[in-house]
Interface confidence: low
């Protein structure tokens, strides 16, 4: 009999690795994890187990390689190949992921639903536990505070249209004898959107005695900053790639004058750069390293450290956008993003937010209020404790993606 | 970001000998095979060599036409593949790359230019 | 070796007309296991190093525009440009990975 409970025990843990694993590599979580896609890229889509096995969830079941593979050798989902030398599993490239179309995302969102109500000390596996007989369940966001304590409210994504309606018109569900708040994505927005609406009135005066107060000190402090920054805006224009982008400028000047902001727009024809010294300085020593041929993406460029009145205006716009750039991100309680004018200065913290796969550590504030962003059926920039993340780099290499799914 | 840089390129004479580095970043060095890859001024694209990783007991491949004078090696503790070149020829003047993968090569490095010639 | 043949040596397109390179290798680049071809199609501009466009013949690195595609299976393989933009004036290469990896001769593409 001992011998039989075993069996049963280690079937069990296959299933989990397989679920785990085809999760990782399956059509909702791949697409969205960079680290993941990174390593497909390098080696015609193999990951080395090593790589692996320093997912979290995927560690705590087991680092067992010939465990691993054994599982997978069972799995019916067939989702997954085994490298020869057993040291490599790779998505089966009979099995291509479906293509991401406007059709594909409405998919998703339309079987994406919101639950509240569950106790904040509820785990990943508590849900998952709960969820077992609700349909079949592909992803689940355990939504997140800033301090990323659970709040008590998930987003699941059901493998169907039909099974997300049977299980948001089932009534009275509970866990735990609690009852449960359950709506579709969709409708969950709408209803946020609404409380909003309600709740912007008030904030707008708030905000506007807030201003008059600070208004006199951030216009001296204005007048201290340009002061400081005098003689370090450096203009560039020309007939710009429309690919030219800030991180070309930041490789252009990577070891001649420390950036510190830029206001481009990708595929604008010029753009200002705020260095932390002076301007000419970096431009010369730039031109010194480039035999004093400057370009950008093989274009030529008109470089033109301001001055004057020019110089004053540009300064003063720069530091509103810093400001703008501070208080969405002070707001918002997460790392901010910039879309037209980025910089790395103004996000405190910054890790320029990309997927780095060694070095520093660089990890993402949790989005209180992420839910406005994310009306694509992909969740927005995710950002989960680490106890109880599951789509995630390996340990060794924790950047949470820009992009993540969820905790599944 | 996977970022490749060769070096170590430079004019040397016939019969002399050369070793370009490839330093790599970006990505977890050890468990990727890497490739060299050359270029003469005006040719087409020429596969050198490569260099597979530690399960695989670090097998080196050779393109058959430079077997014997070309010899790559890796150090996974510096993130660094070598390819060392000896009695070198006019003909081996080229651009050389080092690229990253097994069966595509998504990433390329900048490549560093070799010019033999007395 | 697996000797790779493109052809044409060059071509000149009017923007925004097809532009199409054949390559074709000395024996089937097909895996029976994966079902898939072992064909990668390659970019290079003037001064930079190649940028790799497709792999396993026909699927699309991501970050390639979708007017660019390749076909065929065994030995016959295409790289389309379904409408030329300028910046797409390059060499093209394609490559076998079957065995040890080698390069077809290339194909100059230029504006007409």
């Known amino acids: 009999m001992a011998e039989n409970g075993d069996n049963e025990k280690m079937a069990a843990l296959e299933a989990k690795i397989c679920h785990q694993i085809e999760y990782y590599f399956g059509d909702f979580n791949l697409p969205r994890d960079k680290f993941l896609k990174e390593q497909i890229k390098l080696d015609e889509g193999w990951v080395p187990l090593e790589i692996m096995i320093k997912f979290n969830r995927l560690n705590r079941l087991t680092t067992d390689f010939n465990v691993i593979v054994e599982a997978l050798s069972k799995s019916k989902a067939e989702l997954m190949e085994i490298s020869e030398d057993k040291t490599k599993i790779r998505r089966s490239p009979s099995k291509p992921l479906p293509e991401v179309t406007d059709e594909y995302k409405n998919d998703v969102k339309n079987r994406s639903v919101y639950i509240k109500g569950f106790p904040t000390d509820a785990t990943l596996d508590d849900i998952k536990e709960w969820l077992e007989d609700k349909g079949q369940v592909l992803n689940i966001q355990m939504r997140r505070t800033l301090h990323k304590a659970f709040k008590g409210s998930i987003f699941v994504v059901f493998d169907s249209i039909e099974s997300a309606k049977k299980f948001v018109e089932t009534p009275g569900q509970k866990y735990k004898e609690t009852d449960l708040l359950i709506l579709f994505k969709d409708d969950y927005f709408a209803k946020k959107n609404e409380e909003r609406k309600q709740n912007k009135v008030e904030a707008k005066l708030r905000a506007k005695q807030e201003q008059e107060a600070k208004q006199k000190l951030e216009e001296d402090a204005e007048m201290k900053s340009l002061e400081e920054k005098i003689g370090c805006l450096l203009k560039f224009s020309g007939d710009l790639d429309d690919q030219t982008c800030r991180e070309d400028l930041h490789i252009l000047f990577s070891n001649h004058g420390e950036i510190k902001w830029i206001d481009f727009v990708r595929g604008a024809k010029e753009g200002i750069i705020l260095f932390k010294e002076k301007a000419k300085e970096a431009l010369g020593k730039a031109k010194d390293a480039n035999n004093g041929n400057l370009q950008l993406r093989n274009k030529e460029v008109t470089w033109e450290v301001l001055e004057g009145e020019v110089e004053k205006e540009a300064l003063k716009k720069i530091i509103e956008d810093q400001q703008e750039s501070l208080n969405k991100w002070k707001s918002k309680g997460r790392r901010f993003k910039g879309k037209g004018k980025g910089n790395k200065a103004a996000q405190p913290g910054s890790g320029k937010g990309k997927v780095q796969f060694q070095g520093k550590k660089t990890k993402f504030a949790s989005d209180d209020e992420h839910d406005e962003h994310d009306e694509n059926g992909a969740t927005g920039p995710v950002k989960r404790a680490r106890e109880e993340t599951d789509k995630e780099e390996p340990a060794s290499k924790q950047q949470k993606t820009e992009n993540g799914a969820g905790d599944q | 970001e996977v970022q490749l840089v060769e070096s170590g390129g430079g004019l040397v004479q016939p019969g002399g000998s050369l070793r370009l580095s490839c330093a790599a970043s970006?990505?977890?060095?050890?468990?990727?095979?890497m490739n060299w890859v050359r270029q003469a001024p005006g040719k087409g694209l020429e596969w050198v060599g490569q260099?597979?990783?530690?399960?695989?007991?670090?097998?080196?491949y050779y393109s058959d036409s430079l077997k014997g004078r070309f010899t790559i090696s890796r150090d996974d503790s510096k993130s660094i593949t070598y390819l060392q070149m000896n009695s070198l020829r006019a003909e081996d003047t080229a651009v050389y790359y080092c690229?990253?993968?097994?069966?595509?090569?998504?990433?390329w490095g900048q490549g560093t230019l070799v010019t033999v010639s007395s | 070796d697996i000797v790779m043949t493109q052809s044409p040596d060059s071509l000149a397109v009017s923007l925004g007309e097809r532009a199409t390179i054949n390559c074709r290798s000395s024996?089937?680049?097909?895996?029976?296991?994966?079902?898939?071809?072992?064909l990668a199609w390659y970019q290079q501009k003037p001064g930079q190093p190649p940028k790799l466009l497709i792999y396993w013949a026909s699927t699309r690195e991501s970050g390639v525009p979708d007017r660019f595609s390749g076909s065929g299976s065994g030995t016959d393989f295409t790289l389309t440009i379904s409408s030329l933009q300028a910046e797409d004036v390059a060499v093209y290469y394609c490559?076998?990975?079957?065995?040890?990896?080698?390069f077809g001769g290339g194909t100059k593409v230029e504006i007409k």
């Open positions: 260099i597979r990783n530690k399960p695989n007991n670090y097998e080196t």
């Open positions: 024996q089937s680049l097909l895996d029976s296991r994966t079902k898939k071809n072992y």
């Open positions: 970006g990505f977890t060095f050890s468990d990727f095979w």
């Open positions: 490559k076998q990975s079957y065995n040890l990896p080698t």
């Open positions: 690229t990253l993968g097994n069966s595509w090569f998504a990433y």
